[in-house]
Interface confidence: medium
């Protein structure tokens, strides 16, 4: 079975002038997951990004996040890069606190 | 081995367009973002623009916004810049480099060897 | 926009001796996520640029180990411990902070 998931992209203020913006994909199936910040449409360097364990969310399913620090302004140059089961997505940095995409495939 | 070819360059009239394109090979060149600088004869180098791997990001000096068009083709390994109202400051060499800013060697590690737009009258 | 300024403009260099160019900028290059996006390049005569150092300290591929680059949020340093003649050429730092990305004006290696 596959089960797509549900991405889920925050915002919080880390200190003066940054924030730090954190993806998170829940609900799916298999394990198997590719989830990264871009800048500028380019995946980030591994040392830019903190990244969650894939555990199990009690339902059969995953879920699992990553998160990077970015200047307040430069919201706009970075989207969060989902790949899951030869699907893949992207998600922006809500100009609010929260946003939530479903996939749909 | 990384080559960059440009071509497209020449003389061309104020007012004039030209179009370069940069060949691409020894490199999976959908992978990459890349950018165009060029250099004025006995000058310093300028950033042009800059285009994402899927193309998705563009971004331009304001000295050629709104005149240079940057695309690329990833089937051809191709990145192109077409230049509208040219100017005589924008005689250059123009040069395409890879943009690996997250990769390796990081920014701009590969450059072509450039080809010469004259703009005169 | 970021303002690039370096010095010395030209630097003579006798072989074997060290040289350093410095390079500023107008506002820090210290990204949140403590990367530093300063970059230096050098062009040969009548060739293309080639990367030597890339977020500010880190030696770039094939570059020898003579090089190296350290400094701040807005003041660069660029060192070559034991000038070769093969080292002539001008020298440019660039930020890679924020669009639009801007060089230094260059500073230009010369052999005694």
């Known amino acids: 079975r596959r089960v797509p998931p549900m991405v889920n992209v925050t915002r919080s203020e880390a200190s003066e002038g940054n924030i730090t913006v954190t993806c998170r994909a829940s609900s799916f199936y298999p394990r198997n997951i590719t989830l990264t910040w871009r800048q500028d449409g380019v995946s980030l360097s591994h040392d830019t990004q903190q990244w969650g364990d894939v555990l199990p969310d009690g339902n059969g399913t995953y879920q699992t996040w990553v998160a990077t620090r970015i200047c307040q302004g430069e919201e706009q140059r970075f989207t969060c890069y989902m790949e899951h089961s030869g699907n893949h997505s992207t998600h922006p940095v809500p100009s609010g606190k929260v946003l939530v995409l479903q996939s749909h495939w | 081995q990384v080559q960059l070819v440009e071509s497209g360059g020449g003389l061309v009239k104020p007012g004039g367009s030209l179009r370069l394109s940069c060949a691409a090979s020894?490199?999976?060149?959908?992978?990459?973002?890349m950018s165009w600088i060029r250099q004025a004869p006995g000058k310093g180098l300028e950033w042009v623009s800059y285009i994402s791997p899927g193309g998705d990001y563009i971004y331009y000096a304001d000295s050629v916004k709104g005149r240079f068009t940057i695309s690329r083709d990833n089937a051809k390994n191709s990145l192109y810049l077409q230049m509208n109202s040219l100017r005589a400051e924008d005689t250059a060499v123009y040069y395409c480099t890879t943009d690996r800013r997250h990769y390796g060697s990081y920014a701009m590690d590969y450059w072509g060897q450039g080809t010469l737009v004259t703009v005169s009258s | 926009d970021i303002v690039m300024t370096q010095s010395p403009l030209s630097l003579p260099v006798t072989p074997g001796e060290p040289a350093s160019i410095s390079c500023r900028s107008s506002?820090?290059?210290?990204?949140?996520?403590?990367?530093?996006?300063l970059y230096w390049f050098l062009q040969k005569p009548g060739q293309s640029p080639q990367i030597l150092i890339y977020?500010?300290?880190n030696l770039a591929s094939g570059v020898p180990d003579r090089f190296s680059g350290s400094g701040s949020g807005t003041a660069f340093t660029l060192k070559i411990s034991r000038v070769e003649a093969e080292d002539v050429g001008v020298y440019y730092c660039m930020q890679h902070l924020e669009y639009p990305f801007t060089f230094g004006p260059g500073t230009k290696l010369e052999i005694k």
């Open positions: 506002k820090s290059l210290l990204h949140s996520n403590l990367n530093t996006y």
């Open positions: 977020r500010m300290s």
């Open positions: 020894g490199f999976t060149f959908s992978n990459y973002a």
